[in-house]
């Protein structure tokens, strides 16, 4: 007997569907209607045949009452080949739902997204996460997707992007976006970061995550942020192979005074990098290759310094910096 494709927990909170059959019974997903968090994994299926069964141009208002009754707040859709027209149809219908968080992963979006009709309502998401999503439209995908969303998006995460750079002239500003996560795009690099951070399109960014993005120096990142007019409060550069030294010919970069938290953990650093901000509330240098305790003149003025997991630190060693937060226990780095 094949297992049921959809499982709803006994609290009607989480529903997970794994459609792995070549001809899945999509109606099984109806048991998820009362769930708050829903995950649908389509087993790599091509959803093109769906277009023949649904009228993608139908007025979604006819479904408004049905969709409003859904409790879903967070939806994850993964592992499928999806025609852009079908994605748009789903977004139009979901605009009448209570959906706040949408995650798309391991998807191939085929075809182009039609423009938003004048009478259409955008989807009021607070969070949009994309992982390994490819778009037939190349660099213009964000602008095309953005028109189907209301402007209140607060969190945008784009990982394993096939085209992490955007067509900036087509992208509208994200006035409410406070968190941008471009982590897990190892090919991005500092040049790519400049292309992805469309100038003045992200005016409210407070948290910027750039883990495993091929960044080379904090100074190079500083220059990209300055060029884009992005002034995060918190910057995560962990899991990049960072160089401690700065190219002597590179102009000195002034960090924004807004930055108060910098994560440089797991960055392969053998010494404290040059060109860090002068003052920080939090600096994480854990799990690097520091062979000696940093000297005060090498470090910014910092309230919370974490150095755990560096070779120079032996359990029981005196704390190397006033106000540091080392546990004395070397973590698994």
């Amino acid at each position: 007997t094949t297992p049921e494709p959809c499982e709803l927990d006994d609290e009607d909170f989480r529903c997970v569907c794994n459609f792995s059959e070549p001809q899945p019974d999509w109606s099984e997903a109806f048991q998820c209607v009362s769930a708050v968090e829903v995950e649908i994994h389509a087993g790599g299926l091509n959803l093109e045949p769906f277009l023949k069964r649904v009228d993608a141009d139908a007025d979604p208002r006819q479904y408004a009452d049905t969709v409003k009754a859904l409790r879903v707040r967070r939806l994850t859709v993964g592992a499928a080949q999806v025609p852009a027209q079908l994605l748009v149809g789903a977004l139009r219908v979901l605009a009448y739902s209570r959906l706040k968080e949408l995650t798309l992963e391991d998807l191939k979006i085929t075809g182009t997204m039609p423009p938003l009709p004048l009478e259409a309502t955008g989807l009021a998401l607070s969070s949009l996460r994309l992982r390994n999503v490819s778009w037939a439209t190349g660099r213009s995908w964000l602008a095309e997707l953005q028109q189907w969303l209301k402007p209140g998006l607060k969190v945008l995460s784009i990982a394993q992007a096939h085209s992490p750079a955007f067509s900036c002239e087509q992208v509208r500003a994200f006035p409410a976006l406070t968190s941008l996560d471009l982590s897990d795009n190892p090919g991005l690099g500092e040049r790519g970061l400049m292309a992805a951070l469309c100038p003045h399109k992200f005016p409210a960014i407070q948290n910027l995550a750039l883990r495993n993005t091929g960044m080379e120096t904090p100074t190079g990142v500083c220059a990209a942020l300055a060029a884009a007019g992005v002034q995060p409060h918190s910057l995560d550069l962990s899991h990049n192979s960072l160089r401690a030294t700065v190219n002597p010919s590179a102009p000195r970069c002034m960090w924004s005074s807004a930055l108060n938290s910098l994560n440089l953990s797991f960055a392969g650093l053998e010494q404290v990098p040059k060109g860090l901000p002068a003052k920080l509330r939090v600096l994480d240098l854990s799990c690097n290759r520091l062979n000696r305790a940093p000297q005060p003149d090498e470090l910014p003025e910092v309230d919370n310094l974490t150095l755990d997991g560096n070779p120079f630190l032996v359990p029981g060693t005196a704390l190397p910096h006033e106000g540091s937060m080392n546990s004395g226990v070397v973590p698994a780095c």
Epitope: E11, F13, E37
Partner: antibody, heavy 115, light 111 residues
Framework: QLQLQESGPGLVKPSETLSLTCTVS?????????WNWIRQPPGKGLEWIGY???????SYNPSLKSRVTISRDTSKNQFSLKLSSVTAADTAVYYC????????WGQGTLVTVSS | DIQLTQSPSSLSASVGDRVTITCRAS??????????LHWYQQKPGKAPKLLIY???NLQSGVPSRFSGSGSRTDFTLTISSLQPEDVATYYC?????????FGQGTKLEIK
């Protein structure tokens, strides 16, 4: 048997931040469900503050949203509440609770806001 | 926000009486065929205890004299034969839509 236990200071000064932690045993906060904070002012009714779900997603009561942060530490199987800029009106028993039909409750901890 | 109004606010009944508490929602708390309305009992100094979930399902370990009914906006908690240990405050709560809200409570005493 699932158990929840609140901990944190019983007295907080006005304008400061109230911080509480809930330690969960007998179940994992990252495997299922929603993990809530609910409060009850002395002699009054119950008020839902917000939750953090197994996925890390959060939902807050709009009446408190600007002051509330719920976070979690999955390595310790704990979730936490921070409520900033407290006033005497935030004096209450604070409960941590599992699910959206609230079947499992901590015993509650009284937090008094006073100078 | 969905408002829940309980009635009565307090009541006094004799041991063995049939007791009914009602809860009215300002809008439907149903999602398709399920009513996301739950009932709790709270004794002084204790955390609330779930009695009935999804309008009519008896929570494990709760005596069978407690029952619930209703749908959409109108719900009822019934105690078929009141016992001395049932003295408490009773709350309804909806989880259909956030923010999740409670009724103001019904205080039950023994005559």
């Amino acid at each position: 048997q699932l158990q929840l236990q609140e901990s944190g200071p019983g007295l907080v000064k006005p304008s400061e931040t109230l911080s509480l932690t809930c330690t969960v045993s007998g179940g994992s906060i990252s495997s299922d469900s929603a993990w809530n904070w609910i409060r009850q002012p002395p002699g009054k009714g119950l008020e839902w503050i917000g939750y953090i779900s197994y996925s890390g997603s959060t939902s807050y009561n709009p009446s408190l949203k600007s002051r509330v942060t719920i976070s979690r530490d999955t390595s310790k199987n704990q979730f936490s509440l921070k409520l900033s800029s407290v006033t005497a009106a935030d004096t209450a028993v604070y409960y941590c609770v599992r699910g959206l039909r609230f079947a499992y409750w901590g015993q509650g901890t009284l937090v008094t806001v006073s100078s | 926000d969905i408002q829940l109004t309980q009635s009565p606010s307090s009541l006094s009944a004799s041991v063995g009486d049939r007791v009914t508490i009602t809860c009215r929602a300002s809008e439907s708390v149903d999602s398709y065929v399920t009513s996301f309305l739950h009932w709790y009992q709270q004794k002084p100094g204790k955390a609330p205890k779930l009695l009935i979930y999804r309008a009519s399902n008896l929570q494990s370990g709760v005596p069978s004299r407690f029952s619930g009914s209703g749908s959409r906006t109108d719900f009822t908690l019934t105690i078929s034969s009141l016992q001395p240990e049932d003295v408490a405050t009773y709350y309804c709560q909806q989880s259909n839509e956030d923010p999740y809200t409670f009724g103001q409570g019904t205080k039950l005493e023994i005559k």
